[in-house]
Each structure stands twice: as C-alpha cells, then as structure tokens.
Interface confidence: medium
C-alpha cells in the first residue's frame, strides 16, 4: 500500500525533517505550513490547527516562504538623487540606485546614503578606471601618442591619428592634424566610451534561513529563542555584520 500523505500539522518521524514549504514548530512540536511570499503568519500552528497566514500590509513585504509574525518593512523612500529600480510590493523590497552618471559615495547595509556625480576627466586626461555603482571614475594623464579632447566620465585616451605628413603634431588634449587626405589610425575613429556601470541591488537584503528543523535567530525577529525565519528548507543563514573602516 502507498504511504499515507500527512496533512499539516503532523508530528515528523524521529530524525526526519519537515517537507518543503513546511517548518517545525518548537512549541507545537509539529510540522506546520509556511506562508507564501507576500504573506506572514497571523496565528502560529498548534497540535490541532495549522498556521493561519495573512497578507502583508502596505509598505511591508515577505520575499520567501516564511513563518514570520510580521512582514518586513520596505526600505526608505528613494532620495532625490536616486531612482527606484524596484518598487515596494507585498513580495519584494524597494530598491534604490544612484541615477545614471552618479555613484554611491556613502553606504550602509540599509542602502546608499549619499550619491555623488561621477568624476569627469578633463581634456588631456582619460578614464583609467570606470566608475561603478560604488566607486568613482579614476582619471589618468594621456600618455605620449594618445589624447582626449573631451570632458567625460567615460572617454579613454585615444591614439593620435598617424599622418603621412603632419600639419600639427598631436598632444595630450588634441589629435594630430594631417596635411595628407588619407590619414591612418591604429584604431577606429570616434570617441571611445566605457560602459556605464550596471546597477546592482543595494538595499535591504533579506536573511536566508536555517533548515526548518532549526529555526534561525534572525535579527529581524527579536522574539525569543527560536523565532521563525523566511525561506525554504535547507538554505543557509547569512548573518549581516557592519564592517568597520
């Protein structure tokens, strides 16, 4: 005969774990249902009744299957120098990133506290290291034989064109001028642009849980020795630490 399917809540066999999308409730000592993303546990299970889930309130979310007593608060509204690249919904947090041409000058775990415009390299200087979401552009003087005639946060130093006959020699901020009508170049003409940094998620990451047999003690849920964590069975919990400079 096929094994009977157990319905939550049920007592697990000794040494076994609860199934996917279930968690072990220490108080009831039963395997109980988790709540789906966008919901939270309104009433915890007992020996005779399963978890009662409820939708997250406005400006709160849960991203994973969970048994948290309250949903997580979405991060602060984005500041004027940021763009909201992901809206706050019942299932996901708001994500703010610095607007194009800017980078994060000061950040904490909560996200970017202050955006700053990317440095522009003036004529005679080119981009040595492009800006990223969290670091500024690094400029360098154009080496002999190269130039940049722009003020830009993306242009690198380009080689002077090679003339048959030079009318005006090039310098760090100006290309060579040829008298010949057919100059040659060691690389294609036109400004060379470095790609703009690609924004990555910078705000409020959720902790991932321990296996359901050992509920985590996430800092998000300061409520006793074994509070519930979000996520599915078998994930590992990432503790967030603030790194001192």
């Amino acid at each position: 005969l096929p094994a009977q399917v157990a319905f939550t809540p049920y007592a697990p066999e000794p040494g076994s774990t609860c199934r996917l999308r279930e968690y072990y409730d220490q108080t009831a000592q039963m395997c109980c249902s988790k709540c789906s993303p966008g919901q939270h546990a309104k009433v915890f299970c007992t020996k005779t009744s399963d978890t009662v889930c409820d939708s997250c309130e406005d400006s709160t979310y849960t991203q994973l299957w969970n048994w948290v007593p309250e949903c997580l608060s979405c991060g602060s509204r984005c500041s004027s120098d940021q763009v909201e690249t992901q809206a706050c919904t019942r299932e996901q947090n708001r994500i703010c990133t610095c607007r194009p041409g800017w980078y994060c000058a000061l950040s904490k775990q909560e996200g970017c506290r202050l955006c700053a415009p990317l440095r522009k390299c003036r004529p005679g200087f080119g981009v040595a290291r492009p800006g990223t979401e969290t670091s500024d552009v690094v400029c360098k003087p154009c080496a002999p034989g190269t130039f940049s005639n722009t003020t830009s946060s993306t242009d690198i130093c380009r080689p002077h064109q090679i003339c048959n006959v030079v009318a005006i020699p090039g310098n760090a901020s100006m290309d060579a001028v040829c008298t010949s009508t057919s100059p040659t170049r060691s690389m294609a003409p036109g400004a060379v642009h470095l790609p703009q940094p690609v924004s990555t998620r910078s705000q409020h990451t959720q902790p991932t849980p321990e296996p359901s047999t050992a509920p985590s003690t996430s800092f998000l849920l300061p409520m006793g020795p074994s509070p519930p964590a979000e996520g599915s069975t078998g994930d590992h919990h990432h503790h967030h630490h603030h790194h001192h400079h």
Epitope: L106, E110, L114, A116, H204
Partner: antibody, heavy 120, light 111 residues
Framework: QVQLQQSGAELARPGTSVKLSCKAS????????IDWVKQRTGQGLEWIGE????????YYNEKFKGKATLTADKSSSTAYMQLSSLTSEDSAVYFC?????????????WGQGTSVTVSS | DIVLTQSPASLAVSLGQRATISCRAS??????????MHWYQQIPGQPPKLLIY???NLESGIPARFSGSGARTDFTLTIDPVGAVDVATYYC?????????FGGGTKLEIE
Amino acid sequence: QVQLQQSGAELARPGTSVKLSCKASGYTFTDDYIDWVKQRTGQGLEWIGEIYPGSGNTYYNEKFKGKATLTADKSSSTAYMQLSSLTSEDSAVYFCARSQVYGKIAMDHWGQGTSVTVSS
Amino acid sequence: DIVLTQSPASLAVSLGQRATISCRASESVDNSGNSFMHWYQQIPGQPPKLLIYRASNLESGIPARFSGSGARTDFTLTIDPVGAVDVATYYCQQSKEDPYTFGGGTKLEIE
C-alpha cells in the same frame, strides 16, 4: 513636526539593568536611524550606536558592545536602549537622536535626554 | 577611530564680534567631494542642536550668523556676530565612518 520623547530619570543599583525608551513622532519611524549618545556630567558627547528600525539592523561603538543593547518596536514607533551590569561609570544623561538615511547624514532631531544614576 | 580635536577648549568673545572654533580630524572625513563633518550647539540643560551639516550646510531654522567651512581634516565653525543667546558649548562630529565621534567641545562665553 519631528519629536523624540524619552523616558524619565532612572536610579539603579550597581549590577542591575535599565531600559530607556525613545518614542518618535512626526515622521516615518522605519525610514531613518535612531542614534544613542552618552554624556557624563560636565563631559562631552559619546556615540553609543544606532538602530535602523525598518530592519532592526544595529551598529555599535565597540566600546559599548555588551553594555548597550538597541531595539525598536515598529508598532509603537519606540526605540529602546538597555544598559546592563551597571556601574558608576554608566551614570550619565543618555540622548536619542534621529539621523536620516539620506541627505544630512547628521543627527537633526534629539530627545530631551534621560538621566541615569547608578548608586548603592 | 577618527579622533576629533577642537580648539580652543573655551573662548570669550565680545557681543557683536566674531567667534571662530576649529576642529581637526585625525584622518580625512571627506568622501567624493562631501565632508561628513557636522556642528552642534548645546546650551546647558538641553540636548544638542544641529547647526551645520556636511561642513557648510546651514540647518533649517538656524540663523545665518552661523557658518561652517573646511575640508578633509580641518574645519571651522564661525559665529558672526556673536549674540548673548549663543553662550553654549559647541561640538563637531564626523559621520564618515563608525564609530561616529565627537570633538571635545568648545565653551563659548561673552566677555
């Protein structure tokens, strides 16, 4: 307008604990940090740490780790600081202050302070 | 930790004159063109009050006689002209990195 209302003065015995509160109003409590600052009589200001109530994340001055524990209750918009294993060195006025996540990066609104006296 | 050294420790200025308070950091508090240095006023028996944020920005509601300047490691708070209501202790504070630190304070008196 932004207001931070702190709990009343505390008189405590050495070795015991006290829990100070700071009730915020006039802004979205979960959007900004609450900082705690210590000031001994006639002395300067010392940063203890801060909490981001939206997530419960805390940042401590190493000097106060193990001494101060910061928590926040979103439902009542109240931040708490528990001081444990009190000694005479903990006798001071403790201020809570708001620090916006964005912009100023400074403590722009302060509570009135809570005086803690540790005496046997 | 970033150490902030204020000078002078106390200062006596005549009404209507200029008061200048200095704050020196043990390392730069600048990042990307921003100086994470702030100035507070504390009147006895009251909590500190933010005057200047990020080196030179005047906090809302603070009189224009208060101004801040400086960059990297050297910062100045100027009160010009000094009024009787300005008798207080003034603190600088950095928020570039944890732990945030304060200067030792400068006590301003009227002579």
